[in-house]
């Protein structure tokens, strides 16, 4: 005697996150009389999706038209699909009873799979800058993305980095997962314009990866070099010491000259030049006085350098000595100067 | 008033594959919720039929032909579509597209096309 | 599938005639069964839907009764142009099944 089949002909459907699915079933029998309910998952604690006979289920659409007598198509439309929607869902057919409607047969089920796309990627640096030699580490994480599947690679500046660590969370199955990535970077004077990139690849992304950035420059701390050199000037009576201060990253300087370990003057460092690599250099000037001292004077060029211990350069001025050429100036590029004269 | 004609070769070879394409006319194949049905009558002899597709792309095949067969659906060209594989001469018959409409029965029907399996 | 014996396979009647056909479903099939008719070289025509239903633009001589296992196609009164063939069709289960046809001639 023939009876009522429920057929699901899909097994699976793969449905990218914000589309709408469709879970098709048909009976293959109007009898017996009675309505067709959907469910997520299996036993007592699965989930009505809908039902034919009652209720408002406004993410679902019937793909035929429910009230057709002869109807005996029951598959439904679920629309905006999130990964929360994945599973395996069963058309269960329901014989007319009083005074409930009695389970008759089911579906063997559609396991729904969600694709989601990865979150943009973020890349996170250090708190604290570190200087060139030291080695750094930097975080990449993206999130909400399904199936498991992902693949991540970092590249400094477009070469691949290989020193990295990545988890996928959960381990077991899950609606979506999450991705967190550690990379150890070594850290070198020019990497003022480095990048770091963090790319992940997935079956959601069709070919075009995700990328997230960051600037070394944001990490790297480039500490000056110093150097005091003497000039005569026209006077007899006055010379010319500079102090240059090279090769720093980034611009937060502070200039100190002491006379004899007495602070004679401090300035912030403005009119700076850019190198090519991203550094800055600056110059100092002091016009000194000659004759106002008696005996040599020790200059001192002190800089603090973004908040960290100060770095100094001393020159000792010969008073007794006709002033002459004891250096010369030697960077190119300083062009800002700081002129103040002591008396 | 929605109107089927049924299109393909009236003669095909033995172990061939036999094509019927039938083109809906006066209404749109995707809407409401109709079966579209591909119907056969042997000569001489009563109907049998052979499938159906609708709405959700969903077919059902008689399992004495569902081997051999294939129906589809193209709502672009408003047709629906039959394969009938390996045709022997048993398969000799004249073929019927059919709608079975929002009531039940097939209540819109094609004129028929004569196939004939020979060598 | 569900078998649909038809019966008889023929008959001869006279203009004017009641004509009866009758259909038996192999199992309970409710009333979910058509009626059609067949023209020679013609393809069939709904007559009657859901056993007793008259199908639009069917004149009201055809009537059609029964349910479960047990139907019964009618012609009231038999006209000249009702010379065809009957097929009775349940949709009750897949696959859809039609009977074996009645052939319907004018003494």
């Known amino acids: 005697e023939e009876e009522l089949q429920v057929i699901q002909p899909d097994k699976s459907v793969l449905v990218a996150a914000g589309e709408t699915a469709t879970l098709r079933c048909t009976a293959t029998s109007l009898i017996p009389v009675g309505p067709i309910q959907w469910f997520r998952g299996a036993g007592p604690g699965r989930e009505l999706i809908y039902n034919q006979k009652e209720g408002h289920f406004p993410r679902v659409t019937t793909v035929s038209e429910p009230t057709k007598r002869n109807n005996m198509d029951f598959s439904i439309r679920i629309g905006n699909i999130t990964p929360a929607d994945a599973g395996t869902y069963y058309c269960v057919k329901f014989r007319k009873g009083s005074p409930d409607d009695v389970e008759f047969k089911s579906g063997a089920g559609t396991e729904l799979s969600v694709r989601a796309k990865p979150s943009a990627p973020v890349v996170s640096g250090p708190a604290a800058r570190a200087t060139p030699q030291h080695t750094v580490s930097f975080t990449c994480e993206s999130h909400g993305f399904s199936p498991r599947d992902i693949t991540l690679k970092w590249f400094k500046n477009g070469n691949e980095l290989s020193d990295f660590q990545t988890n996928v969370d959960p381990v077991g199955e899950s609606v979506s997962y999450s991705i967190h990535s550690t990379a150890k970077v070594v850290l070198t004077r020019e990497d003022v314009h480095s990048q770091v990139i963090c790319e992940v690849a997935h079956v959601t992304l069709q070919g075009d990866p995700l990328r997230g950035t960051a600037n070394l420059s944001e990490t790297i701390r480039v500490p000056p070099t110093l150097e005091v050199t003497q000039q005569p000037v026209r006077a007899e009576n006055q010379v010319n010491v500079t102090c240059q201060v090279r090769k720093f990253y980034p611009q937060r300087l502070q200039l100190t000259w002491l006379e004899n370990g007495n602070v004679s003057r401090t300035e912030t460092a403005s009119t700076v030049t850019e190198n090519k690599d991203g550094t800055y250099n600056w110059m100092s000037w002091l016009l000194v006085n000659v004759s106002a001292h008696r005996d040599d004077v020790k200059l001192t060029c002190q800089v603090e350098h973004d908040g960290q211990p100060a770095v100094s350069k001393s020159h000792d001025l010969k008073v007794s000595a006709h002033p002459k050429e004891q250096g010369s100036n030697t960077a190119a590029e300083n062009t800002g100067s700081n002129e103040r004269n002591i008396y | 008033q929605v109107q089927l004609q049924e299109s393909g070769p009236g003669l095909v070879k033995p172990s061939q594959t036999l094509s019927l394409t039938c083109t809906v006319s006066g209404g749109s194949i995707s809407s409401g919720s109709p079966y579209w049905s591909w119907i056969r009558q042997h000569p001489g002899k009563g109907l049998e039929w052979i499938g159906y597709?609708?709405?959700?792309?969903?077919?059902y095949y008689n399992p004495s032909l569902k081997s051999r067969v294939t129906i589809s659906v193209d709502t672009s060209k408003n047709q629906f579509s039959l394969k009938l594989s390996s045709v022997t001469a048993a398969d000799t018959a004249v073929y019927y597209c059919?709608?079975?409409?929002?009531?039940?029965?097939?209540?819109?029907w094609g004129q028929g096309t004569t196939v004939t399996v020979s060598s | 599938d569900i078998q649909m014996t038809q019966s008889p396979s023929s008959l001869s009647a006279s203009v004017g005639d009641r004509v009866t056909i009758t259909c038996q479903a192999s199992q309970d099939i409710s009333n979910y069964l058509n009626w059609y008719q067949q023209k020679p070289g013609k393809a069939p025509k709904l007559l009657i839907y859901d056993a007793s239903n008259l199908a639009t633009g069917v004149p009201s001589r055809f009537s059609g009764s029964g349910s479960g296992t047990d139907f019964t196609f009618t012609i009231s009164s038999l006209q000249p142009e009702d010379i065809a063939t009957y097929y009775c069709?349940?949709?009750?289960?897949?696959?859809?099944?039609f009977g074996g046809g009645t052939k319907v001639e004018i003494k």
């Open positions: 059919a709608r079975e409409g929002y009531h039940s029965g097939m209540d819109v």
């Open positions: 069709q349940q949709f009750a289960y897949l696959p859809w099944t």
């Open positions: 597709i609708y709405a959700s792309g969903f077919t």
